[in-house]
């Protein structure tokens, strides 16, 4: 390897492509999939991390009860569209010409439809609940060490405004982290709450998005924090559009 | 260490073309873009364009577009400026650099006299 | 195209003297702003590489600050080897543009 080479890699996407052939040798980074540049001073949007992912070869404190309105990404992976600027396309469509609406978090928020179908705008999700439950401890965590704990990680690992991370509830071994963040709230430079899910999400799977950082590793007061299940809860400033056939099965 | 070694002094008639060459060594060719700038006399500097040979890619200035051409010979790790359609005013030392983040290394230069 | 606008053109100093010159940007170029040093007859030698970096070998006394559109090359101390012509150019973007270039003279 050579310095350039060394030097030219992408902190924050693993996923990526980079030679040092930008302006006057600028270490340039695409993403897989989409070839398209990404910035790798703070986090990928999730839909051209999809993408990549998809191109790539195949191997005392209640808790809160999430919405009526609140989605589950039940549809799992598929390749989506995204726009110039990375963020999903409102209408995403597979092969076999059937398309649906998605959120800011290629959520899908209607019944699946075929060309026809219309999606007006991209609705932002505005509220993400991350639901986890924790491995047998001897005993509970600490809750205002644990809240503090998942705040440090969210700023620091996922560079997310701590404005943003509403809360953090905890009852063993289940632990909530909600994160808000309206369109108004979002400023240029902003990381969106949903690209920090995501990464969160990978990382809690073992799936770290991060180039050659080691896996998360979350200690509270230094005892090792496991998770065992993650479920992850979309709220839309619009709430979704489904027919009454699929609320009520 | 790092060093560009760039061919001769020209002395060329307007309408011409120069050919200018740019040997490198103490480092990957493929690994670093090539820039070219050059330098009219007494004037300040002007980037004409840049190569990555390890793809091939370029960019020109736009002025120097459909005159300027650049390429690169892994072979002999030799990157050549060519101007065409030469005039007075291209009269400057031509220079080569290797960039990396900004951080460049410079060849010597090449007077290039363009007068009838 | 971005344009670099370096400034003064000129200036006299003395050895010893703190010597600062400007370079403003068209628009915000990221950081990504590299200074150079001439001499007569020579070819151009790096100093600085994004924004505030120093170039391996050179002398401490040169540094580089700013952000967004405008930045400052300062030499705290000013030598008899500093007499020169110093350029900026920003690498933000294709086409890379250079500074006009700023002389400094003896006093």
């Known amino acids: 390897h050579t310095a350039a080479q060394d030097n030219c890699t992408c902190p924050t996407n693993k996923m990526t492509v980079c030679s040092p052939d930008g302006p006057g040798g600028r270490c340039q980074c695409r993403a897989l999939g989409s070839g398209m540049a990404v910035d790798c001073s703070t986090l990928t949007s999730k839909c051209l991390l999809l993408k990549a992912r998809m191109s790539a070869p195949k191997n005392a404190r209640t808790l809160v009860r999430p919405s009526e309105h609140a989605l589950v990404d039940n549809d799992g992976l598929y390749d989506p569209d995204c726009d110039p600027e990375g963020r999903f396309k409102a209408r995403q469509c597979n092969q076999t010409s059937v398309c649906w609406c998605v959120n800011s978090v290629g959520v899908r928020r209607t019944d699946k439809g075929d060309l026809s179908l219309r999606c007006d705008e991209l609705v932002r999700t505005h509220h993400i609940l991350i639901d986890l439950r924790h491995r047998p401890t001897a005993g509970a965590f600490n809750h205002s060490d644990l809240d503090a704990e998942l705040r440090r990680l969210f700023r620091e690992r996922y560079r997310l405004h701590p404005k943003f991370v509403a809360a953090v509830h905890y009852e063993q071994p289940t632990i909530q982290i909600e994160l808000r963040q309206n369109t108004s709230q979002k400023a240029a430079g902003d990381v969106d709450i949903g690209d920090a899910a995501y990464y969160f999400e990978r990382d809690i799977k073992g799936e770290s998005l991060f180039q050659g950082r080691g896996g998360l590793d979350l200690r509270v007061r230094g005892e090792p924090l496991q998770v065992e299940r993650t479920l992850i809860y979309y709220l839309d400033e619009i709430p979704p559009k489904f027919s009454m056939k699929r609320l009520t099965a | 260490q790092v060093q560009l070694v760039q061919s001769g002094a020209e002395v060329k008639k307007p309408g011409s073309s120069v050919k200018v060459s740019c040997k490198a060594s103490g480092y990957r060719f493929t690994d670093y873009v090539i820039n070219w700038v050059r330098q009219a006399p007494g004037q300040g500097l002007e980037w004409m364009g840049q190569i990555y040979p390890g793809s091939d890619a370029f960019h020109y200035n736009q002025k120097f577009q459909g005159r300027a051409t650049l390429t690169a010979d892994k072979s002999t790790n030799t990157a050549y400026m060519e101007l065409s359609s030469l005039r007075s005013e291209d009269t400057a030392v031509y220079y080569c650099?290797?960039?990396?983040?900004?951080?460049?290394?410079w060849g010597q230069g090449t007077l290039v006299t363009v007068s009838s | 195209d971005i344009q670099m606008t370096q400034s003064p053109s000129s200036l006299s100093a003395s050895v010893g003297d703190r010597v600062t010159i400007t370079c403003k940007a068209s628009?915000?170029?990221?950081?990504?702003l590299s200074w150079y040093q001439q001499k007569p007859g020579k070819a151009p030698k790096s100093l600085i590489y994004r924004a505030n970096r120093l170039v391996d070998g050179v002398p401490s006394r040169f540094s580089g600050s700013g952000s967004g559109t405008d930045f400052t090359l300062t030499i705290s101390s000013l030598q008899p080897e500093d007499f020169a012509t110093y350029y900026c150019l920003q690498y933000d973007e294709f086409p890379l543009t250079f500074g006009g270039g700023t002389k400094v003279e003896i006093k």
């Open positions: 628009q915000g170029i990221n950081n990504y």
């Open positions: 650099a290797r960039f990396f983040e900004g951080l460049a290394y």
